[in-house]
Amino acid sequence: PGPPAGSPRVSSDPRADLDSAVLLTRSLLADTRQLAAQMRDKFPADGDHSLDSLPTLAMSAGTLGSLQLPGVLTRLRVDLMSYLRHVQWLRRAGGPSLKTLEPELGALQARLERLLRRLQLLMSRLALPQAAPDQPVIPLGPPASAWGSIRAAHAILGGLHLTLDWAVRGLLLLKTRL
């Protein structure tokens, strides 16, 4: 080994990664909100829709104060990976009725993938547990009908919207603890 020499700073650090994750989450939230509104315009929803395969909402108003960095990042990553799988499934199996939303769904998927990479980098830099907790992966079969795929899209976008809304709040709170 040679004599001690300083290294130049790399282009980001954990706090910058967290800032970047917040910006990406906000941007994804705006995209999701816009796409959900488009869905409601084109295919009005008759009440709330749900899908058994979607993750349950990780946070509530009461739990925000007790959030811990590892738990939030791990859970957020697991949930977003699930939503990514569902968006991919929608694009693949959504049928002709959802084909008109293909460009928006494609952009949404790309943004989700980017946010997941940023979260992974943040977790790596902090040396937090990387392995996602084992969760049963519910196989996603083809929708029963055209209306089934529309209901699924409403459920996926609605759930993703709620998840991202809490993610922004949670990540902003975590910023103060890093």
């Epitope: 650090d13 590892p70 990479r117 980098l121 790596s124 830099r125 040396a127 547990p129």
Partner: antibody
């Protein structure tokens, strides 16, 4: 400018112990997970251990599990590696590194020999 | 035997483009984990070259680029220079080992 400076290496007999230190400066040490990586003479890099930014998570390579202990003192910006029951195959240059190995120290040589 | 497999050596002439591969498995690269690349010049400590598959730290020339697909990744160096002669390592998290793993390293020779 970021600096990581390892110390504590040297010659030790098989079965002996050493404690390596890594003093950090020029970046927010308490925001980074920290690693120890070693490189035997003429060989490739081998990851040894990692500790999370706040010290709550620690992981070890199978080859050192139960013999080496990683720790950190964020108030002193210092990372440690306590090495016990040393073997000849632990002979290597030991580097400390931050984050996704964003920054590396220059290394300290540990020689285990009788 | 490294968990991530790299060719032991690679070579090229100045100005040429060379590619170094890094092959993993379903517990590391294939599990979706990012790949990072490091350069180790003779007699010095390694240095971060590419992180998160294709991102360059400040100060790293754009001649260096990374990509990832499936269970493998690659590092490309274009406009090869004599100062690029070094050992190159890839790394990724591995679920089965619960820690990061390095490739065996590739010695790049500029002819």
């Amino acid at each position: 400018e970021v600096q990581l400076l390892e110390s504590g290496g040297g010659l030790v007999q098989p079965g002996g112990s050493l404690r390596l230190s890594c003093a950090a400066s020029g970046f927010t040490f308490s925001s980074y997970g920290m690693h120890w990586v070693r490189q035997a003479p003429g060989k490739g890099l081998e990851w040894v251990s990692v500790i999370s930014y706040d010290g709550s998570y620690k992981y070890y390579a199978d080859s050192v599990k139960g013999r080496f202990t990683i720790s950190r003192d964020n108030s002193k910006n210092t990372l440690y590696l306590q090495m016990n029951s040393l073997r000849a195959e632990d002979t290597a240059v030991y580097y400390c590194a931050a984050g996704v190995f964003d920054y590396w120290g220059q290394g300290t040589l540990v020689t285990v020999s009788s | 035997q490294s968990v991530l497999t790299q060719p032991p050596s690679a070579s090229g002439t100045p100005g040429q483009r060379v590619t170094i591969s890094c092959t993993g498995s379903s517990s590391n690269i294939g599990a979706g984990y990012d790949v990072h690349w490091y350069q180790q010049l003779p007699g010095t400590a390694p240095k971060l070259l590419i992180y998160s598959n294709n991102e360059r730290p400040s100060g790293v020339p754009d001649r260096f680029s990374g990509s990832k697909s499936g269970t493998s990744a690659s590092l490309a160096i274009s406009g090869l220079r004599s100062e690029d002669e070094a050992d190159y390592y890839c790394a990724a998290w591995d679920d089965s080992l619960n820690g990061p793993v390095f490739g065996g390293g590739t010695k790049l020779t500029v002819l």
